[in-house]
């Protein structure tokens, strides 16, 4: 029989990335358990994660019902065999989370760049629609299904030979950019939702750059 | 097929303890809570606690905690429910019982057949 | 803990007739409900899980569902194997608890 106490997590953070969502803590587990609770402001407490030794908890299958929601999270610790809790009255020790608005702060994955297509001075870019976990009709929506026209991508691209670069912007997932016949370009994308206060921009696509396998030339 | 067996019955006094085991069969018992649930004669069921068999976690009812040790042997893929300092309110069929997947990790979708234990002078 | 009061207590029913029992939570335990079957000298078998969900095998006539902190069981056509002991159980909240159970007889 134990004598260490149980202890409240703390560092209760989201992980979001195209709502992709785990809620992570601390501290290790030392003699206890946790067990997470998740809710929207209006809702009920839905358990997930019993009894478990992680410090981490995929609450996807939640923040997916409805992105728009703000969302809270709370983590519960419990004491592992015949520990002593210090809950109070019998009370179970338990830590709040911040608030989580999916729609609002997932990060936006990176993006890549799906194809490209050169048509004598214009070139055609195409950003990869990336598939989410949010779900409608039993069917995963793509990032543009989500965000619809709230979400713009940028596209850098300069001269392969030099270092200057362009900017373009679209509101679905194509480009066409104005290049010279005959030179080669290189462009990566990134995903923006300027709307945002947060967690705005992605991380910058891979490079790709025209003469490489991506790429179809035509005259 | 999925099973859980049980040891057979026990005869107790107060003060004693007892250990009751749970084999379980056909499935991979590191993946799955088992649970331990008894019924006092004529009663309701009442949750005892919880043991991850993948690395020997538990966790007790507080009315249990202290009284209660449960156990796994992985080589033989059997769970031990202890009782000690029985009293004859512990007379009860004490159920293994085993949690389900992670679409329903704590419903018991499996149960084991149960054993008596009774606590008599 | 949470307290799981389950009624009636018993109930007598004839073949062929739909059978209804609930459960109220003491707080709200969202949909983390299960209920379980159990005759006698036996062990209780899971009919339907988070509330509403239908253990696989188990006869369509079994259901569940959920209003606020009260959930309800019923079985749609009552036949003779059906004659047991109904619980409900909770588990959003530590420690799982079971209500009172629910004596299912044939007139």
């Known amino acids: 029989s134990g004598t260490t106490n149980t202890v409240a997590a703390y560092n209760l953070t989201w992980k979001s990335t195209n709502f992709k969502t785990i809620l992570e803590w601390e501290p290790k587990p030392v003699n206890q358990v946790y067990t997470v609770q998740i809710s929207t402001k209006s809702g009920d407490w839905k358990s997930k994660c019993f009894y478990t030794t992680d410090t981490e908890c995929d609450l996807t299958d939640e923040i997916v019902k409805d992105v728009k929601q703000t969302y809270l999270a709370r983590v519960f610790s419990y004491p592992a065999g015949n520990v002593e809790s210090t809950g109070s009255a019998g009370e179970p020790l338990y830590e709040n989370s911040p608030e989580f608005t999916p729609y609002l702060e997932t990060n936006l994955g990176q993006p890549t760049i799906q194809s490209f297509e050169q048509v004598g001075t214009k070139v055609n870019v195409t950003v990869e629609d990336e598939r989410t976990l949010v779900r409608r009709n039993n069917t995963f929506l793509s990032l543009r299904d989500v965000f619809g026209k709230d979400l713009i991508y940028t596209l850098y691209y300069w001269k392969s030979s030099s270092s200057g670069k362009k900017t373009a912007k679209t509101n679905t997932n194509e480009f066409l950019i104005d290049v010279e016949k005959g030179v080669s370009y290189c462009f990566f994308a990134q995903a923006v939702i300027p709307s945002r206060t947060v967690n705005r921009k992605s991380t910058d696509s891979p490079v790709e750059c025209m003469g490489q396998e991506k790429g179809e030339f035509r005259e | 097929q999925v099973q859980l067996v049980q040891s057979g019955a026990e005869v107790k006094k107060p003060g004693a303890s007892v250990k009751v085991s749970c084999k379980a069969s056909?499935?991979?018992?590191?993946?799955?809570?088992m649970h331990w649930v008894r019924q006092a004669p004529g009663q309701g069921l009442e949750w005892m606690g919880i043991?991850?068999?993948?690395?020997?976690?538990?966790v007790y009812a507080q009315k249990f905690q202290g009284r209660v040790t449960m156990t796994r042997d992985t080589s033989t893929s059997t769970v031990y429910m202890e009782l000690s300092s029985l009293r004859s309110e512990d007379t009860a069929v004490y159920y293994c019982?085993?949690?389900?997947?992670?679409?329903?990790?704590?419903?018991?979708?499996?149960w084991g057949q149960g054993t008596m234990v009774t606590v008599s002078s | 803990d949470i307290q799981m009061t389950q009624s009636p207590s018993s109930l007598s029913a004839s073949v062929g007739d739909r059978v209804t029992i609930t459960c109220q939570a003491s707080?709200?335990?969202?949909?983390?409900l299960n209920w379980y079957q159990q005759k006698p000298g036996k062990a209780p078998k899971l009919l339907i899980y988070d509330a509403s969900n239908l253990e696989t095998g188990v006869p369509s006539r079994f259901s569940g569902s959920r209003s606020g902190t009260d959930f309800t069981f019923t079985i749609s056509s009552l036949q003779p194997e059906d004659i047991a002991t109904y619980y409900c159980?909770?588990?959003?909240?530590?420690?799982?608890?079971f209500g009172g159970g629910t004596k299912v007889e044939i007139k």
């Open positions: 056909g499935y991979t018992f590191a993946n799955y809570y």
């Open positions: 043991i991850n068999p993948s690395g020997g976690i538990t």
């Open positions: 707080q709200d335990i969202s949909n983390s």
């Open positions: 019982a085993r949690g389900g997947s992670k679409v329903a990790a704590l419903a018991f979708d499996i």
């Open positions: 159980q909770q588990y959003n909240f530590h420690p799982l608890t």
